[in-house]
């Protein structure tokens, strides 16, 4: 029967008939830097290529006996999630591996930086098709590892990594804490976060998505036809680098930014119990687990968005944090969140030729997140239109005035500590969805883009009575660009995107002593282009 | 040529200490430092801790990805190396696990 | 182009031992081990094993119940197979083949048993 | 180990499509996705047709194609040649070793 693992990853209508993608990621050459790999195991010959590079630090202690099945048993195990022939994700997938990991499974960071210039210089010698890099391991946050990860992805190379098996924030590590590596978390058959020991999965923002990691079968370098049980998140990881090298073989053109879009679009969605993460962390963490995409055509015609959160800004006064896309994403809509409620807000703003998300603290506050939506958008030309606090009773309103802009977002932004509550109309006059309305006091920012076939609406949904949490989510076929909260007033902790649902937050109703009059009503802005569903449409 | 002036080279190291390898160095270089730059620098880092007595060994020299080389030295030499021309920051070596 | 070269025939008393060798050429020596495998005249192909370039590690059919030895020599990416106590229904062409997917094969070495 | 089951023989005219059949149990073909099947003409050694079940190496025809359904594999060779006339073994990964196929002989009238 198939592993618990790989039917996880299998798109439901498949499972019936054992699907197996045509090309199983032979287009792909997938790299491992991991413990050396007993690359002739029945499970993996002739799909591993072991390269002439090692840099690993001496084993520690004078007792430390080198058995060779012992020196392997990561790497393989992890050859065979990748490309195993029986109890593989991508078995047509050819893997080149790196010796960075010694025989205890440590390395150094300088080992892996050298490692990763060899990929490089291996990619500029002989350029083949696309590459995934699979980095199963983790130390502590390394500034230099994180900043050749990102030049090697500015190269066009995917790279996937293990979250990390420490119960921690992922943030904290490298090269987990990455921006441009995709990082992965590990998820049990119950859909689960893995406990390892006392420890387990890593968690947080700079977690990109969850994959099977618990009791997950694969090649045991024991013997040549072994198979052992592992955990972690390096198993994790190398799931996603098998279901990496199976889209980029069906659509060898992918960019990085397309393919992390494409890997969260095709999820599993809020299946993971998220009371197994600390309280803090909850918000922060996707509730994704990896999947296989149902066809092995793109999805071409899709608007593909995810939510990038900030680190957090700390609790000064003037403290701000900042949410970045990434640089072939467009920021369509910027939010905050405080967990104590007070902040001043957010807005987009021009940093480095690129739009930015900044979300204000504000005094007394704890601190505050910026979040970014940010979207796979071609030919987008996209600006912000400001409009200053209004002063009068109806509130701030700005809309998009140039021809063919259409509304993705809307952001508010205060320099009061406290709004007070000014309750503005909730519903837009007739004709005129390209606006963002707001509080009186604040100044109002509209997220306008310009995009082939780009055509947007606002949904909205109100409660009268005060809620902790109120939701609006987007119809099927359209994609949630922006998310807001109306009032603004300091009672609402702030608004963010889950998938295709917006998220309005509320202070405890019960220690706020709030009045009916504060009712709140969550603003989406959903999304879709014609444009990317007719060329996709052409294609078949 | 001295370090530009008003950008200061910084040093970074592992916050977890058991994780930390003092005595080896990763030096990372500006952006567009090429190879050759990166190869003179490191001369000059091992000539300069020469004169103070103490010994270096360039380990690696980077190019590709990142310019910069990889030494090992003394961590009293920090300060110095931190001073030479075109260094961005010096980040000390640390583990990595298998996961 | 990927090779396997075998040695040549051999011709064995009852009670003696064979040793067999396989010259492999125009791969990753290390990615594949080799198979051995035999075939008794006028009969079907049977698997005698498997042996590794990479770590020397063998494993045999249950049927050889320790008359055979498979060995490697990286240096010489050789591969050998010894067969012990010979007997008459050990006739037949041995062949050693790439890997467990046995997808190249050597041109077979014809072992004649007979007192 | 048992040797997989395959008829002792079967044949077909030229232009004709034939199937061999191969029959083991879920702990040898029903088991894995590595099914392979073997070509030998008199006197050479066997070459691989098929491996993993339905892959074909390169420079194999695509007259040959493999299939598989529950712990019985299939070749099928479509517009038979005179050149097809071979003996033809299957072959299946067990959880530790091998096991090939009795061998069914093909002849093209």
């Known amino acids: 029967s198939i592993p618990w693992n790989l039917e996880r990853i299998t798109p439901p209508r498949y499972r019936a008939d054992e699907y197996q993608p045509p090309d199983g990621g032979s287009l792909v050459e997938v790299y491992l830097l991991d413990t050396s790999i007993q690359s002739d195991h029945r499970e993996i010959e002739g799909r591993v290529m072991v390269t002439d590079f090692e840099n690993v630090p001496e084993e520690d202690g004078t007792r430390f006996h080198r058995q060779a099945s012992k020196c392997d048993s990561h790497g393989t195990h992890l050859a065979g999630v990748v490309s195993g022939r029986d109890a593989g994700v991508a078995k047509g997938a050819s893997m080149r591996s790196l010796r960075v990991l010694n025989c205890q499974g440590k390395g150094t960071v300088s080992g892996t930086l050298i490692g990763l210039e060899f990929i490089r210089k291996s990619q500029l010698v002989q350029p083949v098709g696309p590459l995934v890099v699979l980095l199963p391991l983790a130390g502590g946050y390394s500034r230099v590892l994180n900043a050749a990860c990102q030049r090697l992805a500015r190269a066009g190379v995917v790279l996937v990594t293990a979250a990390g098996n420490f119960r921690d924030d992922a943030c904290l590590y490298s090269p987990a804490s990455a921006p441009e590596v995709i990082t992965v978390g590990a998820t049990n058959a119950q859909d689960q976060p893995v406990t390892l020991g006392t420890l387990g999965t890593n968690f947080g923002r700079c977690v990109d998505l969850f994959a099977p990691g618990e009791d997950i079968i694969g090649a045991s370098s024991d013997c040549s036809t072994c198979f052992v049980s592992q955990s972690g998140t390096s198993q994790a990881a190398a799931h996603v680098a098998g279901i990496a090298a199976m889209m980029l073989s069906a659509e060898p053109e992918l960019t990085l930014a397309e393919l992390r879009q494409r890997l969260i679009h095709f999820s599993a969605k809020d299946v993971i119990n998220e009371a197994w993460f600390p309280e803090d962390q909850r918000v922060l963490t996707p509730n994704l687990v990896a999947a296989l995409p149902p066809s092995t055509h793109g999805a071409g015609w899709q608007l593909f968005c995810r939510t990038v959160w900030s680190a957090h800004s700390g609790p000064t006064r003037m403290a701000t944090a900042i949410a970045r896309c990434a640089p072939d994403e467009e920021l369509l809509s910027c939010s905050s969140f405080s967990r104590s409620g007070k902040r001043r807000g957010e807005r987009m703003e021009a940093q480095g030729g690129k739009l930015v998300c900044r979300a204000h603290n504000a005094f007394g506050g704890e601190g505050v997140y910026a979040i970014a939506r940010c979207c796979l958008l071609p030919q987008a030309n996209c600006s912000v239109h400001t409009a200053p606090p209004a002063e009068a009773s109806m509130g701030t309103r700005v809309h998009c005035h140039q021809q063919g802009h259409v509304l993705t977002g809307c952001s508010s932004h205060w320099e009061v500590e406290d709004l007070g509550t000014h309750k503005p109309p909730v519903l837009r006059p007739r004709g005129q969805p390209n606006q963002c309305v707001g509080h009186r006091e604040a100044s109002i920012h509209a997220s306008c883009c310009h995009a082939p076939g780009l055509e947007c609406k606002v949904k909205e949904h109100g409660i009268p009575a005060p809620q902790e949490q109120v939701t609006v989510a987007c119809e099927e076929g359209w994609t949630l660009t922006g998310c807001s909260a109306l009032p603004g007033t300091s009672h609402v902790l702030g608004a963010y995107a889950v998938d295709n649902t917006c998220v309005v937050r509320s202070r405890d109703v019960s220690t706020t002593g709030s009045t009916s009059e504060e009712a709140v009503t969550a603003v989406a802005i959903c999304c879709r282009s014609r444009h990317l569903a007719q060329a996709s449409q052409e294609l078949q | 040529e001295a370090p530009e002036h008003g950008t200061t080279a910084t040093f970074h190291r592992c916050a977890k200490d058991p994780w930390r390898l003092p005595g080896t160095y990763v030096v990372v270089l500006k952006e567009e430092t090429h190879l050759s730059q990166s190869e003179r620098t490191a001369r000059r880092l091992q000539a300069q801790a020469a004169r103070r007595g103490y010994l270096t060994k360039i380990l690696h020299v980077f190019h590709g990805l990142l310019p910069g080389f990889l030494v090992k030295m003394s961590g009293d030499l920090l300060e110095l190396a931190l001073k030479l021309p075109h260094v961005d920051y010096i980040e000390e070596d640390s583990s990595v696990f298998a996961q | 182009q990927v090779q396997l070269v075998q040695s040549g025939a051999e011709v064995k008393k009852p009670g003696a031992s064979v040793k067999v060798s396989c010259k492999a050429s125009g791969y990753t020596l290390t990615s594949y081990g080799i198979s051995w495998v035999r075939q008794a005249p006028g009969q079907g192909l049977e698997w005698m094993g498997w042996v590794s370039f990479y770590n020397g590690n063998t494993n045999y059919a249950q049927k050889l119940q320790g008359r055979g030895t498979m060995t490697t020599d990286p240096s010489t990416s050789t591969a050998y197979m010894e067969l012990r106590s010979l007997r008459s229904d050990d006739t037949a062409v041995y062949y050693c083949a790439r890997g467990y997917g046995m997808d190249v094969w050597g041109q077979g070495t014809t072992v004649t048993v007979s007192s | 180990q048992s040797a997989l089951t395959q008829p002792a023989s079967v044949s077909g005219s030229p232009g004709q499509s034939i199937t061999i059949s191969c029959t083991g149990t879920s702990s040898d073909v029903g088991g894995y996705n590595s099914v392979s099947w073997y070509q030998q003409h008199p006197g050479k050694a066997p070459k691989l047709m098929i491996y993993?079940?339905?892959n074909r190496p390169s420079g194999v025809s695509n007259r040959f194609s493999g299939s598989k359904s529950g712990n019985t594999a299939s070749l099928t060779i479509s517009g038979l040649q005179a050149e097809d006339e071979a003996d033809y073994y299957c072959?299946?990964?067990?959880?530790?070793?091998?096991?090939f196929g009795g061998g069914t002989k093909l002849t093209v009238l």
């Open positions: 993993e079940v339905s």
């Open positions: 072959n299946s990964y067990t959880s530790t070793s091998m096991v």
